[in-house]
């Protein structure tokens, strides 16, 4: 058993049918010695008496808020949560496996640049009685500080007969050095509590691996005289690291017909302009990627040919 926060404790339960459970000793936080009784949640049934209460925690029915009283007065509370292990594996019931980039991916993180700021998000089908707490550091043995805000509900969507909720959190490395080679990964730890269930989720990554630039901005077309060709130009997104001479992007320019089946013409360039043939009813899209490290491409920025 360990303390998650003041008066909230997590019991680690290796569960299987007929498991003996965990013996837990609760101590009433009071100088009083006599006349102390214990109850669980809203029940008035007295579970025991004395300054300590010994319970056998076998299942969620044994978890909840234990209260010690004396003469009708509440002395202290202890909320017991369960962290359940089955077949040697800690439960992961609260969050949805996003399965990208691989199975058992519960947390996904992205950074728009090398400033040390990043966003992580996760999915759940649970709508109520749910709390998250996020901690982060660079490295784990001699951790360097990363400050994370509060997790917030960022999106809701319907998937079949299921409603899915997306939560996200923003974190900032306290002493980020954008140009430095990373040797220690960022560690992100999410504590999730749903009703009386505790779970924890972790992710470990280098900022360079989670970079996803914003789309190029100010995408414009300039028709070339007496030609079906146009000059496409764009700019680096505002959120990208500077100077651009050091933090350089490469770009992919795509001409896409109205029909998805039509052949796409693609051009790759390190410049912020390109010359392409603009077909009728087509659109031109540009996306960006770090020039020197193959992290994610940005989303597309698009303009119609007409």
């Amino acid at each position: 058993i360990w303390e998650l926060k003041k008066d909230v404790y997590v019991v680690e339960l290796d569960w299987y049918p007929d498991a003996p459970g965990e013996m837990v000793v609760l101590t009433c936080d009071t100088p009083e010695e006599d006349g102390i009784t214990w109850t669980l949640d809203q029940s008035s049934e007295v579970l025991g008496s004395g300054k300590t209460l010994t319970i056998q925690v076998k299942e969620f029915g044994d978890a909840g808020q234990y209260t010690c009283h004396k003469g009708g007065e509440v002395l202290s509370h202890s909320l017991l949560l369960l962290h359940k292990k089955e077949d040697g594996i800690w439960s992961t019931d609260i969050l949805k496996d996003q399965k990208e980039p691989k199975n058992k991916t519960f947390l996904r993180c992205e950074a728009k640049n090398y400033s040390g700021r990043f966003t992580c998000w996760w999915l759940t089908t649970i709508s109520t009685d749910l709390t998250f707490s996020v901690k982060s550091s660079r490295g784990s043995s001699d951790p360097q500080g990363v400050t994370c805000g509060a997790a917030t509900l960022s999106a809701e969507r319907v998937r079949g007969d299921n409603k899915e909720y997306e939560y996200s959190v923003e974190c900032q490395e306290d002493s980020a050095c954008p140009a430095a080679e990373e040797s220690l990964p960022i560690e992100v730890m999410v504590d999730a509590v749903h009703k009386l269930k505790y779970e924890n989720y972790t992710s470990s990554f280098f900022i360079r691996d989670i970079i996803k630039p914003d789309p190029p901005k100010n995408l414009q077309l300039k028709p070339l005289k007496n030609s079906r060709q146009v000059e496409v130009s764009w700019e680096y997104p505002d959120t990208w690291s500077t100077p651009h001479s050091y933090f350089s992007l490469t770009f992919c320019v795509q001409v896409q017909g109205k029909s998805k089946r039509e052949k796409k013409d693609r051009v790759f360039t390190d410049k912020t302009s390109a010359t392409v043939i603009c077909r009728k009813n087509a659109s031109i899209s540009v996306r960006a990627q770090d020039r020197y490290y193959s992290s994610s491409w940005s989303e597309w920025a698009s303009v119609p040919c007409s």
Partner: nanobody, 123 residues
Framework: EVQLVESGGGVVQAGETLRLSCAAS????????MGWFRQAPGTEREFVGT????????YYTDSVKGRFSISRDNAKNTMYLQMSSLKPEDTAVYYC????????????????WGQGTQVTVSS
């Protein structure tokens, strides 16, 4: 929201078998841990057993172990209670319930309840 409807109850002789079904509609059935409870006249609602969302683990009260078996078919949105070697003391209204905590024998850990189906075991 999940709506639950029990069926399969009836009158049987002691020692016989009966299979109860619990059909779910509404939100995704496979998200929920499911349980069976029963209530005899003049008594509190009593835990029978529970099954986890994947159907890979079950947990029973001592009095039904070895006689009752819970299973589920997530493709059919249905949970089952196979009852064998029935005794007169198994006579009760049987309720199915859906919740988020497995295992739990406590009724208030379940969020959704069916209306119940009567099982009567005569000697």
């Amino acid at each position: 929201e999940v709506q639950l409807v029990e069926s399969g109850g009836g009158v049987v002789q002691a020692g016989e078998t009966l299979r109860l079904s619990c059909a779910a509609s509404g939100r995704s059935f496979s998200n929920y841990e499911m349980g069976w409870f029963r209530q005899a006249p003049g008594t509190e609602r009593e835990f029978v057993g529970t099954i986890n969302r994947r159907g890979s683990s079950t947990y029973y009260t001592d009095s039904v172990k070895g006689r009752f078996s819970i299973s589920r078919d997530n493709a059919k949105n249905t949970m089952y209670l196979q009852m064998s070697s029935l005794k007169p003391e198994d006579t009760a209204v049987y309720y199915c319930a859906a919740g988020w905590l497995f295992p739990s024998s406590r009724s208030r850990d379940y969020d959704y309840w069916g209306q119940g189906t009567q099982v009567t075991v005569s000697s």
